[in-house]
């Protein structure tokens, strides 16, 4: 499956939007840093089947969408930027869904890669728990925004590696 050229442009736009969502200077938030235990192994070059990688990327973007579409995120972050962000993520999800269908077919996909998808979900649960414990403070959002930018960058790298293997 060939992801369209617009997909990588959308990735870059999403990252730019995340960067623009900064509300406070991050230098005051160092003490709020947290280890979310990003599931690095799901993004490494193991004997990754392309279909598995696409499923993991899809889950990553879906969970990012869920995280940023809560009432709390709307209250903490710029709504115009969030709306643009949703549009980019929605397009990414559509691109990846088309690919999943082509690569493995809709029936096998969720079951075959359950462990990988579960690892991504647990990662986002940890992020949500952190925000709850920190009462959705400005610094907590700043830490989460930085974390999502990092994980998003790693997702983009995985997509680039997939493209180069074609």
């Amino acid at each position: 499956c060939d992801l369209p050229q617009t997909h990588s442009l959308g990735n870059r736009r999403a990252l730019i939007l995340l960067a623009q969502m900064r509300r406070i200077s991050p230098f005051s938030c160092l003490k709020d840093r947290h280890d979310f235990e990003f599931p690095q192994e799901e993004f490494d070059d193991k004997q990754f089947q392309k279909a598995q990688a696409i499923s993991v990327l899809h889950e990553m973007i879906q969970q990012t969408f869920n995280l940023f579409s809560t009432k709390d995120s709307s209250a903490a972050l710029d709504e115009t930027l969030l709306d643009e962000f949703y549009i980019e993520l929605d397009q990414q999800l559509n691109d990846l869904e088309s690919c999943v269908m082509q690569e493995v077919g809709v029936i096998e996909s969720p079951l075959m890669y359950e462990d990988s998808i579960l690892a991504v979900r647990k990662y986002f649960q940890r992020i949500t728990l952190y925000l709850t414990e920190k009462k959705y403070s400005s610094c907590a959002w700043e830490v989460v925004r930085a974390e999502i930018m990092r994980s998003f960058s790693l997702s983009i790298n995985l997509q680039k590696r997939l493209k180069s293997k074609e």
């Epitope: 960067a19 200077s25 160092l30 003490k31 840093r33 930085a146 974390e147 990092r150 960058s153």
Partner: antibody, heavy 121, light 107 residues
Framework: EVQLVQSGAEVKKPGESLKISCKGS????????IGWVRQMPGKGLEWMGI????????AYSPSFQGQVTISADKSISTAYLQWSSLKASDTAMYYC??????????????WGQGTLVTVSS | DIQMTQSPSSLSASVGDRVTITCRAS??????LNWYQQKPGKAPKLLIY???SLQSGVPSRFSGSGSGTDFTLTISSLQPEDFATYYC?????????FGQGTKVEIK
């Protein structure tokens, strides 16, 4: 391979201006902050300030606020430390180092080789 | 500002000795404490981050412990290449601050 390469040694007179540089390579320059550290002859390490190259946001140590300016040009992956009017007491080795920002990763894991600044009349 | 106080300021030891350096913060910094090694004419090198995590490529004879205000760097068996100056540094809040350093010399 991650590298921070600093500009060469400088010999200046009191009152002169100076801008030294730190060029990052082998990693995404805007994904890490760049910190500056001073070491006066025979002395310990002093943190001067830090910059986020993605948007040039800065934080300074109160001891250095107003004395130096930290800047960055992300298009050429370079951070700068500058003085508008040097003093003899600015004579020191200056190091740049990268910092992971708010991400859970090692602080100041890579350092430049240092730039020796000598200020003498 | 958070003050970082290291002790001792210098020590003499022999190859094979167990060496312990302590660092005390003027307020709680949780585990946001790093240890660096510096040799004459060289840039500092990160040894330990987040109080106890060993930086990649650093020998396992180096270890860090502590949280809150009191921290320790231990070299389990001193090697000839370990004679250097060691600095602790807090990354809990800006301004980031270093300890004054501990010079480890040959006895």
């Amino acid at each position: 391979e991650v590298q921070l390469v600093q500009s060469g040694a400088e010999v200046k007179k009191p009152g002169e201006s100076l801008k030294i540089s730190c060029k990052g390579s082998g990693y995404s320059f805007t994904s890490y902050w760049i910190g500056w550290v001073r070491q006066m002859p025979g002395k310990g390490l002093e943190w001067m300030g830090i910059i986020d190259p993605s948007d040039s946001d800065t934080a300074y140590s109160p001891s250095f606020q107003g004395q130096v300016t930290i800047s960055a040009d992300k298009s050429i992956s370079t951070a700068y430390l500058q003085w508008s009017s040097l003093k003899a007491s600015d004579t020191a080795m200056y190091y740049c180092a990268r910092h992971p920002g708010l991400n859970w990763a090692p602080d100041f894991d890579y350092w430049g080789q240092g730039t020796l600044v000598t200020v003498s009349s | 500002d958070i003050q970082m106080t290291q002790s001792p300021s210098s020590l003499s030891a022999s190859v094979g000795d167990r060496v312990t350096i302590t660092c005390r913060a003027s307020q709680s910094i949780n585990e946001f404490l790093n240890w660096y090694q510096q040799k004459p004419g060289k840039a500092p090198k990160l040894l330990i981050y987040f109080a106890s995590s060993l930086q990649s490529g650093v020998p396992s004879r180096f270890s860090g412990s502590g949280s809150g205000t009191d921290f320790t760097l231990t070299i389990s068996s001193l090697q000839p290449e370990d004679f250097a100056t060691y600095y602790c540094q807090q990354s809990y809040s800006t301004p980031l601050t270093f300890g004054q350093g501990t010079k480890v010399e040959i006895k």
